[in-house]
């Protein structure tokens, strides 16, 4: 798979492959994987990809299911790259405050907050 | 501050305090703090709160600016709690796949993806 495929297209294709291979993937009746109990997904990327690793190690490889796991590994690579960009630019306090304000604003309007 | 205040109310109050104390906070002309270069805030919570720590250590405390940093520390506590919940529940594969599908769906529709 060329890593040049846009990440948005990669995600779409991965969603389709996930549907296609669902029956194969759920064949292991006894396997248990940690599942986050809230919907703030970005907080849980580490656990999600650990779960994917567990699933991959328990799944017979070959054909397009291999492509599914390859895609998921490219998505992880993209997310790891995004995480690296969290601390790259050192800026004046006013800019940090604007980012903090935006973060809290998004938290206020978009996060699923259970008190 | 009672920690029983709902997190959503805490976030709203913190946004207001951030506006109130902006002039005081930006007084340090030479301080530089890492600012994430993308809008996927949840991926950067660690760096954001490190930045808040840097800012707090450089800010004269007292009055309601102290309340601002106390609030931010309670918000951090809430987010740390959410992160703990990422791997608490072990579930069958089909449940993990449902969560993974939702995660990719949200990534597909809501994330700011720069290829």
């Amino acid at each position: 798979i060329p890593t040049e495929i846009p990440t948005s297209a990669l995600v779409k294709e991965t969603l389709a492959l996930l549907s296609t291979h669902r029956t194969l993937l759920i064949a292991n009746e006894t396997l248990r994987i940690p599942v986050p109990v809230h919907k703030n997904h970005q907080l849980c990327t580490e656990e999600i990809f650990q779960g994917i690793g567990t699933l991959e190690s328990q799944t017979v490889q070959g054909g397009t299911v291999e492509r599914l796991f390859k895609n998921l590994s490219l998505i992880k690579k993209y997310i790891d790259g995004q995480k690296k960009k969290c601390g790259e630019e050192r800026r004046r306090v006013n800019q940090f405050l604007d980012y903090l304000q935006e973060f809290l604003g998004v938290m206020n309007t978009e996060w699923i907050i259970e008190s | 501050i009672p920690t029983e205040i709902p997190t959503s109310a805490l976030v709203k109050e913190t946004l207001a305090l951030l506006s109130t104390h902006r002039t005081l906070l930006i007084a340090n002309e030479t301080l530089r703090i890492p600012v994430p270069v993308h809008k996927n805030h949840q991926l950067c919570t660690e760096e954001i709160f490190q930045g808040i720590g840097t800012l707090e250590s450089q800010t004269v405390q007292g009055g309601t600016v102290e309340r601002l940093f106390k609030n931010l520390s309670l918000i951090k506590k809430y987010i740390d709690g959410q992160k703990k919940k990422c791997g608490e529940e072990r579930r069958r594969v089909n449940q993990f796949l449902d969560y993974l599908q939702e995660f990719l769906g949200v990534m597909n529709t809501e994330w700011i993806i720069e290829s």
Epitope: E88, R91, Q101, E102 | E29, V37, K39, E114
Partner: antibody
């Protein structure tokens, strides 16, 4: 490498509104490390800061122009815009857009706007 | 609001040292940025954070800042250095950007 390009009419009539757009390429306008700024330069004079905007929409304006200036951002088009209302001949200048980190890193080439009837 | 004052012009012979000043109330507590602008071109940063040079800017360009005056120093001046030079700071009390009026550097001869 980030590049910025100003576009808009080069001639505006007095009392009308000057409108310019800056298109950003080679980088995302949603980059949290940058403000997006407008600066102008009257013929033979120094640089004058007009204002800047953050991707979230927070704006900061030069107090001397604040009552007439609006800066907006369109993250979907990777563009930001300047509107300056009630223009007079004194608003004739070269208008630059620029990215502003700790300093002005990248500049457009500038566009001359003449206010004349 | 905060005001920066620069001399309108400075003249210097090639090979000599040019000093361009930027005055402001307690400017030493602020970070100062210097831009070079040649006719018909956009400005280019030559010094940031008082005395740091961006990559690609010759070592001949240096800066200092203390008290009420920041100074851009260009040593061994060349004909190609002839340009307008502007200083810039942030006014942290208002989150505003402030430019000096600019100084025209003329290289004699």
């Amino acid at each position: 490498q980030v590049q910025l390009q100003e576009s808009g009419p080069g001639l505006v009539k007095p009392s009308q509104t000057l409108s310019l757009t800056c298109t950003v390429s080679g980088g995302s306008i949603s980059n949290g490390g940058y403000y997006w700024s407008w600066i102008r330069q009257h013929p033979g004079k120094g640089l004058e800061w007009i204002g800047y905007i953050y991707y979230s929409g927070s704006t900061y304006y030069n107090p001397s122009l604040k009552s007439r200036v609006t800066i907006s951002v369109d993250t979907s088009k990777n563009q930001f815009s300047l509107k300056l209302s009630s223009v007079t001949a004194a608003d004739t200048a070269v208008y630059y857009c620029a990215s502003l980190g700790n300093w002005f890193d990248y500049w457009g080439q500038g566009t001359l706007v003449t206010v004349s009837s | 609001s905060y005001v920066l004052t620069q001399p309108p012009s400075v003249s210097v012979a090639p090979g000599q040292t040019a000093r361009i000043t930027c005055g402001g109330n307690n400017i030493g507590s602020k970070s100062v940025y210097w831009y070079q602008q040649k006719p018909g071109q956009a400005p280019v940063l030559v010094v940031h954070d008082d005395s740091d040079r961006p990559s690609g800017i010759p070592e001949r360009f240096s800066g200092s800042n203390s008290g009420n005056t920041a100074t851009l120093t260009i040593s061994r001046v060349e004909v190609g250095d002839e340009a307008d030079y502007s200083c810039q700071v942030w006014d942290s009390s208002s989150d505003h950007v402030v430019f000096g009026g600019g100084t025209k550097l003329t290289v004699l001869g």
